[in-house]
């Protein structure tokens, strides 16, 4: 199935559409603004999913969606907002967000294969971040504060969570 | 609306290197979308060539893979197509292609290439 | 890469009657609930262009009498009613993955 119907030429109605499309694929011939990690098709006079597209690299709307996307397909790796960069966990293990908490929790299991300042980390020996939280998971009970990420920038509980939230 | 043209040297012999570029007027190809060569040989067969995203990033046919190369120059709103050690195989009429979404909505009209001693 | 395969090389349909295409992929063309099968007529000293975009969907300015139905591995282009101006190589396209391939092409005429 095509996932789609005839397009405004082609003489679906908008009910139609949206039958067709309860998440709001449609957005009606007018509109070209489209819900987040969507974009507009021209072709088509809908808002798409921006999954559909990162293969082909189209449209400038999805860049950071199908960045995003294809850090999260990497192991050991998560996708920072604000920084818009693929961060790979082994270099912020101890002070992760939940996103690393996987292959962090596990790196730290083994303590063979972890840097010598981790190790130290574990041992006690840093004192700043040995509530074992982390400086990332932390973050959203400690209200505004800088963020780990972008030392000189604060952030809201409420910004931190939107930032670090997949 | 957005127009795109080819323009080639038309004749090249086996062996040697060539660049094929496409002017792109109406729209930059800084600002969003997909730019893409594609090629029809004699007997109408049509093959994807590669393509030069917006951002500036490639992605070429794996079955051309090392012996080309999309760049642009984003002053002149060109993108270029370079094919090396070329063999009368190559031989083909080429055309640039905008995808927009995941389809080729405007194209060229086509610069023939005849590889030939 | 997704092999297209094209049927039949060559039609002849009267006017007035209908023309069907088909295009049989190697592999699925569906993701996201899409079909990524797009079909272009060229005529000839022109490039192609867009007919049918993601399966059944017409592309600008593309007359009703073309319409196209399919998904996962198998599409058709429907002509109807056969025109003239009809007259045309018909190329299948899929976009779900990089490389995009194309189908041989059909070659239409009137009877």
């Known amino acids: 199935m095509s996932g789609l119907g005839r397009s405004r030429r082609g003489g679906r109605s908008r009910v139609d559409q949206e039958e067709r499309f309860p998440q709001g694929l449609w957005t009606g011939v007018a509109m070209r603004s489209c819900p987040e990690e969507q974009y507009w098709d021209p072709l088509l006079g809908t808002c798409m999913s921006c999954k559909t597209i990162c293969n082909h690299q189209s449209q400038r709307t999805c860049a950071a969606f199908c960045r995003s996307l294809s850090c999260r397909k990497e192991q050991g790796k998560f996708y920072d907002h604000l920084l818009r960069d693929c961060i790979s966990c082994a270099s912020i293990c101890g002070q992760h967000p939940k996103q690393c908490a996987y292959f962090c929790e596990n790196k730290l299991r083994s303590p063979v294969n972890l840097p010598p300042e981790l190790r130290r980390q574990r041992s006690g020996e840093v004192e700043n971040n040995s509530d074992n939280s982390g400086r990332y998971q932390g973050l959203e009970h400690r209200g505004s504060e800088a963020s780990p990420a972008l030392p000189g920038l604060k952030l809201s509980a409420d910004q931190v969570a939107l930032v670090y939230s997949t | 609306d957005v127009q795109l043209q080819e323009s080639g040297p038309g004749l090249v012999k086996p062996s040697q290197s060539l660049s094929l570029t496409c002017t792109v007027s109406?729209?930059?190809?800084?600002?969003?979308?997909?730019w893409h060569w594609i090629r029809q040989f004699p007997g109408n067969k049509l093959e994807w060539v590669g393509y030069i995203s917006y951002s500036g990033s490639t992605r070429y046919n794996p079955s051309l893979n090392s012996r080309i190369s999309i760049t642009r120059d984003t002053s002149k709103n060109q993108f270029f197509l370079q094919l090396k050690s070329v063999t009368t195989e190559d031989t083909a009429t080429y055309f640039c292609?905008?995808?927009?979404?995941?389809?080729?909505?405007?194209w060229g009209l086509g610069t023939t290439l005849t590889v030939s001693s | 890469g997704i092999v297209l395969t094209q049927s039949p090389p060559s039609l002849a349909v009267s006017l007035g009657q209908r023309a069907t295409i088909s295009c049989r992929a190697s592999e699925s063309v569906d993701n996201y609930g899409i079909s990524f099968m797009n079909w272009f007529q060229q005529k000839p000293g022109q490039p192609p262009k867009l007919l049918i975009y993601v399966a059944s969907n017409q592309g600008s300015g593309v007359p009703a009498r073309f319409s196209g139905s399919g998904s996962g591995t198998d599409f058709s282009l429907n002509i109807h009613p056969m025109e003239e101006d009809d007259t045309a190589m018909y190329f299948c396209q899929q976009s779900k993955e990089v490389p995009y391939t194309f189908g041989g092409g059909t070659k239409l005429e009137i009877k």
């Open positions: 292609a905008r995808v927009v979404s995941t389809s080729f909505d405007s």
């Open positions: 109406g729209f930059s190809i800084t600002s969003d979308y997909a």
